[in-house]
């Protein structure tokens, strides 16, 4: 028995009561030492919780009158009073006492942090930490094993395990996300260390496998067939190829490339949006030269960490057969342009030269030719150009012609080439005076005096420089009043051969001059120089003669 510390009159045993009892439980008696048993003392309970207990007013016996729940209230602190009914007064001061509620295992373990979700990389090794789950048991941890929990895996073998005492979930077998990407694990928590009578609770853990790059991309087809028109320009996309990768996200990003293309005609670029390989024409193709190509393409992942390279040793490859499609192409001239030569003066129908165009296509269509640019030429179906008129180099030394070739099988197929015709010079023009000469001689001219310096021109082209020869015509020997001297530099000087002239008697002299060129054969012209006598006064200067309105005649002829 215990006595109240403050007042030695109260006596009781420690009070305990089992929780969750349906029957009335009497827990013990309160007694005052002053109570002599004459039934004059009355016992009373006061305080919070007094409603859960009753006391026998005469005997002081305390009983639990309600079912108690330790997890709700584990201690009841009550006050007791004893009254002497004979005097109607408390014989003791109020005393506090405690009723402790004893635990029974009436609570199962509970997981309070639900939902449990975890992410772990696929192919993680055994023992990899996934997540820790924790269950709580409301029972008294100090009473037996009521709150001692053991964890156990109800669902999740053989991929996962749980540490019994910690609730730590670990990987127990490698998992491949590409086979299964989500796992539902059920963990059971049991109290009483799993002994008979244990209560249990479960929780579900959702475990997602994150992707690692453990799959290389693989072509969907071992052979792709594509076509390209021979008229396709470089840079043309001629088709797509595609690989698949079981990984996701960045791990599925791939790059396509050419592994083998001896012709170096194609390229492959990657469309990173669609993850397709686009086959591009790098060089123009020609059906007549090569009408099919084979290339080998490969595909690799864009991002591969060093430790995962073992999954990517051999890149997947595919073969691409590319068929060139024939296009009816226009004719092709053998030369980009032609320079033909013909001497001037040739008769109508003279062959100038031949141009040639061919059909680059396999069917080799015959050609028809048309010529524009001059009416001096024509062309036949063999591409032979002939003259339709006699050509004069001095009228035109070059002709710029355009020859058009069309395929007889398809007149829409047309090509053109420039033909430049150079007309060669022949010596068909005699030299002549280079200008019109207005020649005067003074009446008082002296013998040997210079009357005129003459020069010549020749409309012909000269391979070397022209050389002209000047002579006084033999027909004109009776005219001895003037003399001609060839300067040997394509000029000649006319000198007075006498002293004094008479304007009234002989106002005009006609001097016949022969001019020859150095062509083969040489050509000579006969030219008449008209020399007018002029009254120059004392000055002996002919400059004023032209202003005197003298009548003169000048002529020349060519032989």
């Amino acid at each position: 028995d215990y006595k109240d510390d403050d007042d030695k009159a109260w006596v009781w045993r420690p009070f305990v009561v089992l929780e969750e009892m349906d029957d009335i439980q009497c827990v013990g008696k309160l007694r005052s030492d002053l109570d002599n048993g004459n039934n004059s003392f009355q016992y009373k309970l006061l305080g919070i919780g007094a409603g859960s207990f009753s006391i026998n007013e005469r005997t002081g016996e305390i009983c639990a009158i309600q079912k108690l729940d330790r997890e709700e209230k584990s201690l009841y602190i009550l006050r007791a009073q004893v009254i002497d009914t004979t005097i109607g007064k408390a014989v003791e001061t109020e005393s506090e006492f405690v009723i402790r509620v004893l635990d029974i295992n009436d609570n199962e373990p509970r997981f309070l942090d639900e939902p449990y979700e975890a992410i772990v990389p696929e192919m993680s090794p055994e023992g990899t930490f996934v997540i820790k789950v924790t269950a709580n048991d409301a029972d008294d941890p100090s009473t037996g094993y009521h709150a001692r929990i053991l964890y156990n895996l109800e669902r999740g073998q053989p991929y996962f395990s749980v540490e019994p005492t910690t609730g730590v979930i670990r990987i127990s077998s490698k998992m491949d996300r590409e086979l299964q990407d989500t796992y539902c694990v059920i963990i059971q928590a049991k109290d009483m260390l799993g002994q008979p009578g244990a209560l249990s609770g479960t929780t579900t853990v959702s475990i997602k496998l994150s992707d690692i790059n453990d799959n290389k991309p693989i072509f969907k087809e071992s052979l792709y067939r594509l076509t390209v028109s021979e008229s396709a320009p470089t840079g043309t996309s001629i088709g797509t190829i595609m690989a698949y990768d079981n990984d996701i996200g960045e791990n599925a990003e791939m790059d396509y490339s050419i592994e083998e293309d001896d012709s170096q005609t194609f390229d492959i670029i990657t469309n990173h949006e669609t993850q397709e390989g686009i086959v591009i024409l790098k060089k123009k193709v020609d059906f007549e030269h090569q009408n099919h190509y084979g290339i080998r393409a490969k595909v690799k992942n864009h991002h591969v960490p060093e430790q995962l390279m073992k999954y990517h040793t051999e890149a997947s490859t595919t073969f691409i057969k590319i068929q060139v499609e024939d296009v009816d192409e226009p004719p092709v001239f053998l030369l980009p342009y032609y320079i033909l030569e013909i001497p001037e003066g040739k008769p109508y129908g003279t062959i100038v030269g031949t141009v040639s165009a061919t059909d680059p296509d396999r069917r080799q269509s015959p050609m028809r030719y048309y010529l524009t640019g001059s009416k001096m030429f024509d062309i036949n179906d063999n591409g032979t150009i002939i003259t339709t008129n006699m050509l004069d180099r001095e009228v035109s030394a070059w002709y710029n012609l355009t020859v058009t070739a069309t395929e007889t099988y398809n007149v829409q197929q047309i090509s053109s080439a420039h033909v430049y015709v150079q007309v060669f010079n022949i010596n068909d023009n005699a030299p002549e005076f280079s200008q019109f000469y207005e020649t005067y001689v003074c009446e008082n001219a002296e013998s040997g005096e210079i009357v005129q310096i003459i020069s010549a021109i020749d409309r012909d082209e000269s391979i070397e420089d022209h050389h002209f020869y000047f002579n006084h015509s033999l027909e004109d020997t009776n005219n001895s009043s003037f003399m001609l001297t060839d300067n040997q530099d394509n000029t000649a000087v006319i000198l007075s051969n006498r002293t004094g002239f008479n304007l009234k008697e002989e106002p005009v002299f006609y001097m016949i001059i022969l001019i020859a060129d150095n062509g083969i054969p040489s050509l000579t012209s006969t030219n008449t120089l008209t020399i007018q006598v002029c009254d120059c006064g004392d000055s002996r200067n002919t400059e004023t003669c032209a202003n005197k309105g003298l009548l003169f005649i000048m002529g020349f002829r060519t032989e």
Partner: antibody
Framework: QVQLVESGGGVVQPGRSLRLSCAAS????????MHWVRQAPGKGLEWVAV????????YYADSVKGRFTISRDTSKNTLYLQMNSLRAEDTAVYYC????????????WGQGTLVSVSS | EIVLTQSPGTLSLSPGERATLSCRAS???????LAWYHQRPGQAPRLLIY???SRATGIPDRFSGSGSGTDFALTISSLEPEDFAVYYC????????FGQGTKVEIK
């Protein structure tokens, strides 16, 4: 195993027509380009025509262009060669051949059928 | 078109001897697109070599192909009785053309 069997050959007069057939078995016919090749008596081989795996493209040797037509019926696994305006120089053993999947050479040939053009 | 010229026209050899057959193209054959066939009398041709040097399925290793561009060769390291036949080269770079053939006969 792969088998190609030609039929339809025979004697025909110049200017007339003939149709050759080639029955294919032992492989996925619709995946392969197919060819006709001929061999004049005592002479070498001459390529005649090709048809693509799906029948969309045909190409011919210049010597037969405009006269011969190659075709295929995937449902019957059969290749055909329609020969019109036949000439004496078309006389030959006609072989059908399968083009290699990863190449353009001919990996399987039929035993051939003889076409004889004479009056 | 690409013209293939085979030489020699006839090759007379004994079994066990080495045979070298030549095939020359009139223009370069792209990507080694050249094949070799042999044809026994009364039979269809049979593919021996493709891609100038790759042996076809089931072809013994005594057959080997070489060359590129315009000059190609087929070598039979040691002739077997069944190797005496007509051999054709074929280009498939531009359309398909065959050489005129080389006859390998028993000496």
């Amino acid at each position: 195993q792969v088998q190609l069997v030609e039929s339809g050959g025979g004697v025909v007069q110049p200017g007339r027509s003939l149709r050759l057939s080639c029955a294919a078995s032992g492989f996925t016919f619709s995946s392969y380009d197919m060819h006709w090749v001929r061999q004049a008596p005592g002479k070498g081989l001459e390529w005649v025509a090709v048809i693509s795996y799906d029948g969309t493209n045909e190409y011919y040797a210049d010597s037969v262009k405009g006269r011969f037509t190659i075709s295929r019926d995937t449902s019957k696994n059969t290749l055909y060669l329609q020969m019109n305006s036949l000439r004496a120089e078309d006389t030959a053993v006609y072989y059908c051949a399968r083009e290699r999947y990863f190449d353009w050479s001919f990996d399987y040939w039929g035993q051939g059928t003889l076409v004889s053009v004479s009056s | 078109e690409i013209v293939l010229t085979q030489s020699p026209g006839t090759l007379s050899l004994s079994p066990g001897e080495r045979a070298t057959l030549s095939c020359r193209a009139s223009q370069s054959v792209s990507n080694t697109y050249l094949a070799w066939y042999h044809q026994r009398p009364g039979q269809a041709p049979r593919l021996l070599i493709y891609g100038a040097s790759s042996r076809a399925t089931g072809i013994p290793d005594r057959f080997s192909g070489s060359g590129s561009g315009t000059d190609f060769a087929l070598t039979i390291s040691s002739l077997e009785p069944e190797d005496f036949a007509v051999y054709y080269c074929q280009q498939y770079s531009n359309s398909w053309t065959f050489g005129q053939g080389t006859k390998v006969e028993i000496k």
